[in-house]
Amino acid sequence: QTSVSPSKVILPRGGSVLVTCSTSCDQPKLLGIETPLPKKELLLPGNNRKVYELSNVQEDSQPMCYSNCPDGQSTAKTFLTVYWTPERVELAPLPSWQPVGKNLTLRCQVEGGAPRANLTVVLLRGEKELKREPAVGEPAEVTTTVLVRRDHHGANFSCRTELDLRPQGLELFENTSAPYQLQTFVLPATPPQLVSPRVLEVDTQGTVVCSLDGLFPVSEAQVHLALGDQRLNPTVTYGNDSFSAKASVSVTAEDEGTQRLTCAVILGNQSQETLQTVTIYSFPAPNVILTKPEVSEGTEVTVKCEAHPRAKVTLNGVPAQPLGPRAQLLLKATPEDNGRSFSCSATLEVAGQLIHKNQTRELRVLYGPRLDERDCPGNWTWPENSQQTPMCQAWGNPLPELKCLKDGTFPLPIGESVTVTRDLEGTYLCRARSTQGEVTREVTVNVLSPRYE
């Protein structure tokens, strides 16, 4: 009678086990073990027992002890069950961002692991079990569907295998996949709102604002603003579920023409974009040209207005004839023209908008000096001892220097309040002098004595 100990063994894959083969007779002709496993006979005194070390046990095996005794041959089997945790436990790759409301299929694949009868696959959200199934097939596959909710944002999904060998006196062996962190998002179907100037002048700055409501999580939204190839650097302000991105845009002569302004909002694996055209234009102010900005009275003056080739100008309110970018007028300079403004207004149509530019030049007319009766009366009669202010205004450009002297020495205090005395009486020679020449005018002051009764 052959016996084997232990009769049943559960051992880790690649492990070793000691198996003792015994026989009931004292002097067996043969006592051994039959197995494809690497084996070593170990030290055990006596003839009716042998102990073997079976090593590198990779799969379930049934070594067989045999003995040959005088009463015949017999055998006994030991059952080796190999256990090993799965070599691969992983969730099928998924995009980390998932839109709210979508059905998400979680698929867990399990390669290896034994004994399969003790192996269970569990799909989890955090620590909450979503599905539990025995491992079947190679690789074993367990799937479940999850309706993506807003509150799933940041949740970790994982797959766990449980090799439960507690009934065999061992432990529960757990293997967990790398977690899949779900990022949920809501990107509305409406494109972002883009507010910007439709036209923008070269060498100026404009402000562009892009905004969108109904986003989740708004802090994860990426905003890209660009004008043509120029990437703008916006300042983004976030609300609860909205953002507003504000950027300054500077344009140069190189940008002239029609440019695409884009605002793209990227959230998760989706994007919304708004396109707008901005026309970049160059429109210098019109040029007002005077033959000479300073002329003497009586000189003929030409005033020209020149603007952008596509502009239409008016000079001092008079449209160019024919309507176009140039206008001019001729005049003979009079004192009244001194300080006269010549204003040129140019209008350019850019992308359906009328752009206005003005330029003004002032004409200086040199004339005079002039002393006339209106501004410098030739005769004053004042009561003695009265308070009077002698007034005499000389005209001219440049403004003349005025002196009124009696007998070449006694000055008449022009523009000053004086008490009329006899000394004030007489004829004064008023002389107005400037770079344009000089004029004189006699002014007589009469003093009335008071009548004594």
Epitope: K40, E41, L43, L44, P45, G46, N47, V51
Partner: antibody, heavy 121, light 108 residues
Framework: QVQLVESGGGLVQPGGSLRLSCAAS????????INWVRQAPGKGLEWVST????????FYADSVKGRFTISRDNSKNTLYLQMNSLRAEDTAVYYC??????????????WGQGTLVTVSS | DIELTQPPSVSVAPGQTARISCSGD??????VHWYQQKPGQAPVLVIY???KRPSGIPERFSGSNSGNTATLTISGTQAEDEADYYC??????????FGGGTKLTVLG
């Protein structure tokens, strides 16, 4: 540290008796099988005897069977070899050696320094 | 009964590899252990269970066992390795068996 110290060796006449002792320290003596191994002058190692951890099983080489008795006192952490009917060919250095904890593998991981037994008239 | 046979001596130049054989019937089916013994000292276990090295034994010592022959290999032999080397196995009766021993001489 783990140590085995043999004693009791000496000169004895053929046919005489001698008792060797081996004092163990530094390990749980009652968990291990212990062996006696001898080495005749200028010769190789020869296994003499083995005793199980509890003393219930003893094993001998054919050359000493019936003449030598191995025993142990686990309370004193001491191994003994009672040698009777000594012969000239028993002259050797006697070592006590500890078999590894799992005696099935049959190797000796700790050895004493040895004690010399000389059988001569 | 198993009988273990070793060459009486092996010589090796320093730094070279020394191989000491131990042969016996179906020796590969049992475990073989190796001991080093220097003059006047007790034996020291250098290899057990065919190829395992006890702690404190240099990595240059290795072992193998298959068929009828077990081999102790000392790579990069050093002068301090000069000693007697014994292989050991077991049988039912007698219980433990030693080889006759090999004297390793490191030349130079």
């Amino acid at each position: 540290q783990v140590q085995l110290v043999e004693s009791g060796g000496g000169l004895v006449q053929p046919g005489g008796s001698l008792r060797l002792s081996c004092a163990a320290s530094g390990f749980t003596f009652n968990s291990y099988y212990i062996n006696w191994v001898r080495q005749a002058p200028g010769k190789g190692l020869e296994w003499v005897s083995t005793i199980s951890s509890d003393g219930s099983n003893t094993f001998y080489a054919d050359s000493v069977k019936g003449r030598f008795t191995i025993s142990r006192d686990n309370s004193k952490n001491t191994l003994y070899l009672q040698m009777n009917s000594l012969r000239a060919e028993d002259t050797a250095v006697y070592y006590c050696a500890r078999t590894t904890l799992n005696y099935y593998y049959g190797y000796m991981d700790v050895w004493g320094q040895g004690t010399l037994v000389t059988v001569s008239s | 009964d198993i009988e273990l046979t070793q060459p009486p001596s092996v010589s090796v130049a320093p730094g070279q590899t020394a191989r000491i054989s131990c042969s016996g019937d179906s020796l590969g089916s049992k475990y073989v252990h190796w001991y080093q013994q220097k003059p006047g000292q007790a034996p020291v276990l250098v290899i057990y269970s065919d190829k395992k090295r006890p702690s404190g034994i240099p990595e240059r010592f290795s072992g193998s066992n298959s068929g009828n022959t077990a081999t102790l290999t000392i790579s990069g032999t050093q002068a301090e390795d000069e000693a007697d080397y014994y292989c050991q196995s077991y049988d039912s009766n007698p219980m433990l068996v030693f080889g006759g021993g090999t004297k390793l001489t490191v030349l130079g």
